[in-house]
């Protein structure tokens, strides 16, 4: 086809942005290009072309008319992680191609299984008590809090320190006795550990 004066090569006018998305949630990587004739858009991840519903109608990835890449749900397993990675969109027409900036798609996850559940503890009044848990693996790394008898633990109490997965009570009172649960939280949600009982004995 011969070059028409009004034709021009593609240029990216909206670049995709980095995303962090929860597993199972929808997501969109934006891309908009100009050019005449209207450029075709393809997406690449780690140098490999990304399959969309244009290739396989069952695909969970859709190429939108705008050129954006829409994920019906972010797919992310224990081993296979087909959606995570660094993406670029490429706009092409007969005059050339334009490549977007890199955009990383990270998947936020929070597994179900605590790596370490807290254990029952028995102490005498006035003695220190320590409970320890390791929350499920997660990204971003889950923060840890504790509940006592179903309510958030009062960490303003100067006797109580929460550091890493450790709950430390410097000197126990009878009122500290109860059922404790470790809670791991990130943007995906929260997970609760198994219950551990703190028993405080009279001296």
């Amino acid at each position: 086809s011969r070059l028409r004066q009004e034709d021009f090569p593609p240029r990216i006018v909206e670049h995709p942005s980095d995303l962090i998305v929860s597993k199972g949630e929808p997501a969109t990587l934006n891309c908009k290009a100009e050019g005449r004739p209207t450029p075709t858009i393809e997406w690449y991840k780690g140098g490999e072309r990304v399959e969309t519903d244009k290739d396989d109608p069952r695909s969970h990835r859709m190429l939108l008319p705008s050129g954006s890449l829409f994920f019906l749900r972010i797919v992310h397993g224990r081993r296979s992680k087909p959606d995570e990675g660094v993406y670029v969109c490429v706009a092409r027409n007969y005059l050339g191609e334009a490549v977007s900036h890199n955009a990383s798609l990270e998947v936020a996850i929070l597994r179900d299984d605590f790596r370490q559940n807290p254990s029952d503890v028995m102490v005498a009044v006035g003695e220190p008590a320590v409970m320890e848990c390791q929350p499920p693996r997660g990204h971003p790394e889950p923060t840890i809090s504790w509940k006592k008898d179903g309510s958030p633990l009062d960490d303003k109490d100067e006797r109580i320190t929460i550091r890493g997965g450790k709950l430390m009570i410097t000197y126990t009172r009878k009122s500290d006795a109860g059922k404790y649960v470790c809670v791991g939280t990130n943007m995906v949600g929260e997970r609760e550990s198994e219950v551990a009982e703190l028993t405080v004995l009279e001296r």
Epitope: K45, G46, E48, R49, V50, E51, D55, D56, V75, H76, G77, R78, R79, S80, K81, P82, D83, G85, D112, D113
Partner: antibody
Framework: EVQLVQSGAEVKKPGASVKVSCKAS????????MHWVRQAPGQGLEWMGW????????NFPQKFQGRVTMTRDTSITTAYMDLSRLRSDDTAVYYC???????????WGQGTMVTVSS | DIVMTQSPSSLSASVGDRVTITCRAS??????LNWYQQKPGKAPKLLIY???SLQYGVPSRFSGSGSGTDFTLTISSLQPEDFATYYC???????FGGGTKVEIK
């Protein structure tokens, strides 16, 4: 269309090795782990291990360690399973299977019959 | 290794019957459990993943339930094409159960 196409049937002598191939098409080869599963005649499914096509890392259950090798060639989107020191009880249909991001084997090859007989 | 125990190993049923197959894990596996159907001479086919999610294209008469150590596959109304062998698989260590053969009564 997403599919896995395996190499043809093999007949081997005890002590020999066999290499089965699995050609992937219709998806991003490096995005999904590939597994190998075998099934002896009239028996159940036995998982043999996985390969991460992106890195080449592998993992096998104790039973197959030292006897199985899994490799891949990303340029031709093909995974390979090599089983050495064959015995008669290795006679089975060998399947490759893609592990989805939902932790399940969603796409399977058609199977390769390997017969070990003297 | 986590051992998967399926029961029964075989069962006889008629078209239209409700069929239940159970799978027990030797330790807790959360919802990391899949179910497959296999017909003679064919590769297995994924039915259910993550204990209860129906794979694309699988008829809704198949359902899965359970969490932790005990899991169930239910076929609400058995169809002629459902006579096959069914396998559970835990997706932590990837081992399969021994299979359940569903035969015509």
């Amino acid at each position: 269309e997403v599919q896995l196409v395996q190499s043809g049937a093999e007949v081997k002598k005890p002590g020999a090795s066999v290499k089965v191939s699995c050609k992937a098409s219709g998806y991003t080869f490096t995005g999904y782990y590939m597994h190998w599963v075998r099934q002896a005649p009239g028996q159940g499914l036995e998982w043999m291990g996985w390969i991460n096509p992106k890195s080449g890392a592998t993992n096998f259950p104790q039973k197959f360690q030292g006897r199985v090798t899994m490799t891949r060639d990303t340029s031709i989107t093909t995974a390979y399973m090599d089983l050495s020191r064959l015995r008669s009880d290795d006679t089975a249909v060998y399947y490759c299977a893609r592990e989805s991001g939902d932790d399940a084997f969603d796409i399977w090859g058609q199977g390769t019959m390997v017969t070990v007989s003297s | 290794d986590i051992v998967m125990t399926q029961s029964p190993s075989s069962l006889s049923a008629s078209v239209g019957d409700r069929v239940t197959i159970t799978c027990r894990a030797s330790q807790k596996i959360s919802s990391y459990l899949n179910w497959y159907q296999q017909k003679p001479g064919k590769a297995p086919k994924l039915l259910i993943y993550a204990a209860s999610s129906l794979q694309y294209g699988v008829p809704s008469r198949f359902s899965g339930s359970g969490s932790g150590t005990d899991f169930t596959l239910t076929i609400s109304s058995l169809q002629p094409e459902d006579f096959a062998t069914y396998y559970c698989q835990q997706s932590v260590g990837l081992f399969f159960g021994g299979g359940t053969k569903v035969e015509i009564k």
